[in-house]
Each structure stands twice: as C-alpha cells, then as structure tokens.
C-alpha cells in the first residue's frame, strides 16, 4: 500500500511540525492505525501511535507528543516539543487494521529540520 | 439520513432465480463494506457474507457458495444479492447491513418466499 | 468455523429485576491487532437487529446505560441491569473477528 508524506518541513520556533501522511485508499478499511517512526542510521523508533476507526476521529494517548486529525485517507500529524537535537527522517507507517485482508505500507519519510530559538539577550 | 433500502423479496418457484436489491444512501457507499444477513422463519440470524464495495470482491459464508452472488452497482449506491436454483429452504427474510467495526444500520428485510 | 452458543435459550423477567445472556465462542476471538469483534443485537418481531454493544464492553449511541457487556477470550455476557417492557425481544451476539463471521442461536427475553 502506498503511503506518501512530504519530503522536508521546518519545524517551528515552538519546535511543532505538522505533515499530511496520506495512504493508498483505504477502500472499506473501518479501522486503521498510524505510527509516526523516528529512523536514525538503521535504527527505528516509535515516536507515536493512533488507531481510529471511519466512525470516529483520530486518538492519540493524551501524554503522546503527537496530535492529530483524520478525513478519508489523509492524516494530519503535528509532533510537537521538538528540539534541535530530534532532527531527523521520519516515518509515517500505515496499517489497515479491519476488516480483513490486513494491509501495511510506510512513507520514505519527513526530514524534520528543528532549530532551537535564540536565546533573548538580556535587557537592561 | 442514513438509510438502506431493500426491495426484490417475491414468491418464486423452485428452480428459479431473484436478484434482492439494497439502495444506500446518506453516506459515501464505496466506503463501507454491505453485508448480507438471512434469517428463515422462526429461527435465527445467519450471516451470508460481506461485499467490499469499494473493491468489488465478494466473501461468502461456506453455506452461501456456489448459488449466490453478491454484486454491486456503485452509480446507484446499490448492493445485490441473486439466489439461483431457488429451493424452499432460501425462504427467509434477507436483510443488508453496513458494516464498519459493527452493524449501525440495517435494511428493513426483504421476503423471499419459495414455493410451487 | 466458529460456534457461537447462547445460554439460556429464553429468559423470563419481571420489570425492575436484573437479566444476564451468556456468549461462549469455541474458540478466541481475539482478532489479530488484539481487539475483540463481540457485539450484541436485539431484535424485535417484524423489525431489523439494533447494534446496542461492539467491541464487548462499548455502548452504542443512544442504548440506554442499563445494558452493559462484558467477558473476554471465549466468555461474554450481555447484563440488562433492570429491565423494562420495551427490553423484550431477541438478544443474538456476533463475532466479527474470524471468518466466516458468526452469530449466535439467540436468547428470547420475556417480560412478566
């Protein structure tokens, strides 16, 4: 299954990045689940995960660092508490949970470029 | 309003064939998969199997191969399910179910007497 | 393929008093991404099945709260806390966890 997410996004002041990751349709999938992967050389990490089913909106766990929101077949994702050193590629991963037969497909990945602020010169 | 609409229930002979029919409306149809329940009289609900609409492809239940087809219409929004060969034991009432992680709504039935 | 075998085969009770269906599968039904696909349906004569539980323990929108689900694995039981007149019906639970996708016989419930 086709999944696809941008190339490159800048992460803002707040260190908050946001990407659609859209999949290949879902057809009559009424339960899918979306992982946000971080790779880093060969290895993957789970930065985030959510499951939500065509009659009900997208849930991440509430102390996740992610948010988001579904239509159709296109998710927006926003992580947020980012920080220079969490530049990195990463992966939006697909799965079509239910019914059956089970798909799963990842993106190439989001280079997220995260810049910490300047810190405010003191002021006399 | 979501709604399923059946209609095609009739008294036909033995050895014949009926194509029951389930309008849907109120939602995207190719986004849910319909299912086909039977129920004969007097007795329980049994599940025929499930159509993606989206795909097209039919699953059926191991006592609904061969004589039955489950197709679909995507212009019209409409599921079909044709019964061929009929026998006095498809008489039963035919209900249509949209189906996501469970079955919100139902056809209101649709009554296939099979008789000479 | 999966049994799904209801007890008892009809109930009778009185207006107030608790009802409990049982639901046993002959086999897990735990689906492959670790949920469990049991819901329970009432029907009424002449009238289509109404979704009152999915996923064993969630309540459909609208049912009133006293009717409640439970159970795991292979056992599932469908509580009315108290029932009342427009309770009476037939109560089916269904697996939609391994095809060929299953109910079970039915429970009648009778009001005294």
């Known amino acids: 299954m086709h999944v696809a997410q941008p190339a490159v996004v800048l992460a803002s002041s707040r260190g908050v990045a946001s990407f659609v990751c859209e999949y290949g349709s879902s057809g009559n999938a009424a339960e899918v689940r979306v992982t946000v992967l971080r790779q880093a050389g060969s290895q993957m990490t789970e930065v985030c995960a959510a499951t939500y089913t065509v009659e009900d909106e997208l849930a991440f766990l509430d102390d996740s660092t992610c948010t988001g929101t579904s239509s159709g077949n296109k998710v927006n994702l926003t992580i947020q508490g980012l920080r220079a050193m969490d530049t990195g590629l990463y992966i939006c991963k697909v799965e079509l949970m239910y019914p059956p037969p089970y798909y799963v497909g990842m993106g190439n990945g989001t280079q997220i470029y995260v810049i910490d602020p300047e810190p405010c010169p003191d002021s006399d | 309003e979501i709604q399923l609409v059946q209609s095609g229930g009739d008294l036909v002979k033995p050895g014949g064939s009926v194509r029951l029919s389930c309008k849907a409306s109120g939602y995207t149809f190719t986004n849910y998969g319909m299912n086909w329940v039977k129920q004969a009289p007097g007795k329980g609900l049994q599940w025929m199997g499930w159509?993606?609409?989206?795909?097209?492809?039919?699953t059926y239940a191991d006592d609904f191969k061969g004589r039955f087809t489950f197709s679909l219409d995507n212009a019209k929004n409409t599921a079909y399910l044709q019964i061929n060969s009929l026998r006095a034991e498809d008489t039963a009432v035919y209900f249509c179910a949209r189906r996501s992680i469970y079955y919100p709504y139902w056809g209101q039935g649709t009554t296939l007497t099979v008789s000479s | 393929d999966i049994v799904m075998t209801q007890t008892p085969l009809s109930l009778s009770v009185s207006p107030g008093e608790p009802a409990s269906i049982s639901c046993r599968s002959s086999?897990?039904?735990?689906?492959?991404?670790?949920?469990?696909?049991l819901e329970w349906y009432q029907q009424k004569p002449g009238q289509s099945p109404k979704l009152l539980i999915y996923k064993v323990s969630n309540r459909f929108s609208g049912v009133p709260d006293r009717f409640s689900g439970s159970g795991s694995g292979t056992d599932f039981t469908l509580r009315i806390s108290r029932v009342e007149a427009d309770d009476a019906g037939v109560y089916y639970c269904?697996?939609?966890?391994?095809?060929?996708?299953?109910f079970g016989g039915g429970t009648k419930l009778e009001i005294k």
């Open positions: 269904f697996q939609g966890s391994h095809v060929p996708w299953t």
């Open positions: 159509i993606n609409t989206y795909t097209g492809e039919p």
């Open positions: 086999q897990s039904i735990v689906y492959s991404n670790g949920n469990t696909y």
